[in-house]
């Protein structure tokens, strides 16, 4: 057994199989390119501000570095796909959704048409889909990560949909609406089974899921609160009630991170108590969105993660642990429930 000798050269786990030796890592570690060494991947805060998308390391002093992107005009919503180290963002002036690698290379617009104010956007890292909410068109749409196979999922009775969060392992998407009656809604990731979770809320933003503890977090622009609830919108808790203007929000491990427009800051606190507050970065005007780039924010599994659910176009997760195949606009699903036919 080659693993018996110096652990096969592996830093952590050595697996001996008929095909040969393979190094592996415990949960929370990642194998680097030498295929032998496991490291805890570095966590970054990513934030959008005007024409900038910047990153701040949460583990080193490598603070506030701009990702070298050209042509960004007014970045708004942000997300990422950890498997290929790419970030995705919406630009509300260009009216586009774009992506690039974390080093700024291979920048491309993946959605360029039919957008008005794409203020919410999220990556389905299991199904390799892109979801977005447009406050101008009053639609929630989906496509593949490259923008192909676009489909409108929700359009009826939508009033300025804003923040969007996905739970692909469970098959649900969550969004906030800022219209006449602000609220937080949930639906299956194919747009079905829509329900209102939180009807009595102000303009909720920064909608974020704590996947481990199964809680929703959001900022309320009308009450200036940071709130939390369970995944059904119940057991609501106020995490912070003394902030002047919280806006963007994300969660990572034991902390929530938020932007405050009045304090011109990115701050963090304990996610349950709201205590132990720290300013991560100050002197920042109008930070639009904030997220933590780390593999632990994109774990889990569903049927779409395996061969796209054998769907020809879109594989859309639904509860509980299921999926449906989806077709682009004007295409129709065949009797096999897997393939789509052109009009």
């Amino acid at each position: 057994n080659p693993c018996a000798e110096e652990n096969g050269g592996c830093s952590h786990l050595c697996l001996y199989r008929p095909q040969g030796l393979r190094c592996a890592c415990p949960i929370g570690f990642e194998l680097i390119s030498d295929m032998k060494t496991c490291i805890v991947p570095e966590a970054f805060l990513l934030f959008s501000r005007r024409a900038d998308i910047r990153r701040i390391s949460l583990e080193t002093n490598n603070n506030n570095v701009a990702i070298p992107l050209t042509g960004v005009k007014e970045a708004s919503a942000l997300d990422f796909d950890v498997t290929d180290n790419r970030i995705y963002w919406t630009d509300i002036s260009l009216k586009t959704i774009s992506r690039a690698f974390m080093n700024g290379s291979a920048l491309e617009h993946v959605v360029e048409f039919g957008l008005d104010y794409p203020e919410g956007m999220a990556v389905d890292w299991l199904g390799k889909n892109l979801y977005w909410a447009d406050t101008g068109t009053n639609r929630i749409e989906v496509s593949k990560l490259d923008g192909q196979h676009r489909q409108v999922l929700v359009w009826k009775d939508l009033d300025s949909p804003r923040a969007l969060a996905l739970d692909p392992a469970e098959g649900f998407m969550y969004w906030t609406e800022w219209g006449g009656k602000p609220k937080i809604d949930r639906a299956a990731m194919d747009g079905s089974e829509r329900t209102t979770l939180v009807p009595n809320v102000g303009r909720a933003n920064g909608l974020t899921i704590d996947y481990a503890k199964r809680r929703l977090y959001w900022t309320d622009l009308d009450t200036n609160l940071i709130e939390s609830s369970n995944m059904l919108g119940l057991n609501r808790e106020v995490i912070a009630d003394d902030l002047p203007h919280p806006f963007g929000l994300t969660q990572y491990q034991d902390y929530i991170y938020w932007t405050d427009w009045s304090r011109r800051s990115i701050e963090r606190a304990n996610k349950t108590s709201g205590q132990n507050r720290t300013i991560i970065q100050g002197h920042l005007d109008y930070v639009m969105d904030i997220l933590v780039f780390h593999s632990s924010r994109q774990s889990g599994w569903n049927e779409c993660a395996s061969s796209n659910g054998h769907c020809s176009h879109l594989c859309l997760a639904v509860p509980v642990g299921g999926f449906v195949c989806g077709c682009p606009a004007h295409y129709s699903l065949n009797a096999d429930n897997r393939t789509c036919s052109a009009p």
Partner: antibody, heavy 119, light 108 residues
Framework: QVQLKESGPALVKPTQTLTLTCTFS??????????VGWIRQPPGKALEWLAW???????SYSTSLKTRLTISKDTSKNQVVLTMTNMDPVDTATYYC???????????WGQGTLVTVSS | DIVLTQSPATLSLSPGERATLSCRAS???????LAWYQQKPGQAPRLLIY???NRATGVPARFSGSGSGTDFTLTISSLEPEDFATYYC?????????FGQGTKVEIK
Amino acid sequence: QVQLKESGPALVKPTQTLTLTCTFSGFSLSNRGGGVGWIRQPPGKALEWLAWIDWDDDKSYSTSLKTRLTISKDTSKNQVVLTMTNMDPVDTATYYCARMHLPLVFDSWGQGTLVTVSS
Amino acid sequence: DIVLTQSPATLSLSPGERATLSCRASQFIGSRYLAWYQQKPGQAPRLLIYGASNRATGVPARFSGSGSGTDFTLTISSLEPEDFATYYCQQYYDYPQTFGQGTKVEIK
């Protein structure tokens, strides 16, 4: 209720230094965010932004007047002070202080104080 | 510095009429970094609109803002007697923030 009031000399001589004080109530510049800015308006003319200071003591100045302006705050007294050196008759204007709850948006204003520069 | 050009310089209208004021930036200032202020003679300016389209607290619904990029508009849907004043736009996309030269809305 947010209130701001400017105070300072109504008349200054050319080359002198102008010191204006903004005393405010209804908000704080401690840790609750926001800031205070100064804007002036020559008689019959448009508004011109001069400077601002935020809760965290970050400061910003008008490009053209940067070398002549200094802004500071006294959090305990709820005051912001603007000094402007080397005054000239063209600096004759009504000087306003205003609160910024959101950066660079002036949502509450003082009544203004007219400063005349003349020998 | 970014220059804001307001037009027209003077707008002569009657109460009840619709007023449309324009503010054009010399370069791109995004979709939400513009404010509008109202100033009456002998008074301090008053914030009307921020973020290009958000009404400030206590501002009547007849005031609305729109636009993005370089072209912005303040609309007063039906002029009331107290609306006759001078209106200034202000950009805060880039430092230093700057004001337009104003549009005076006068009674015809």
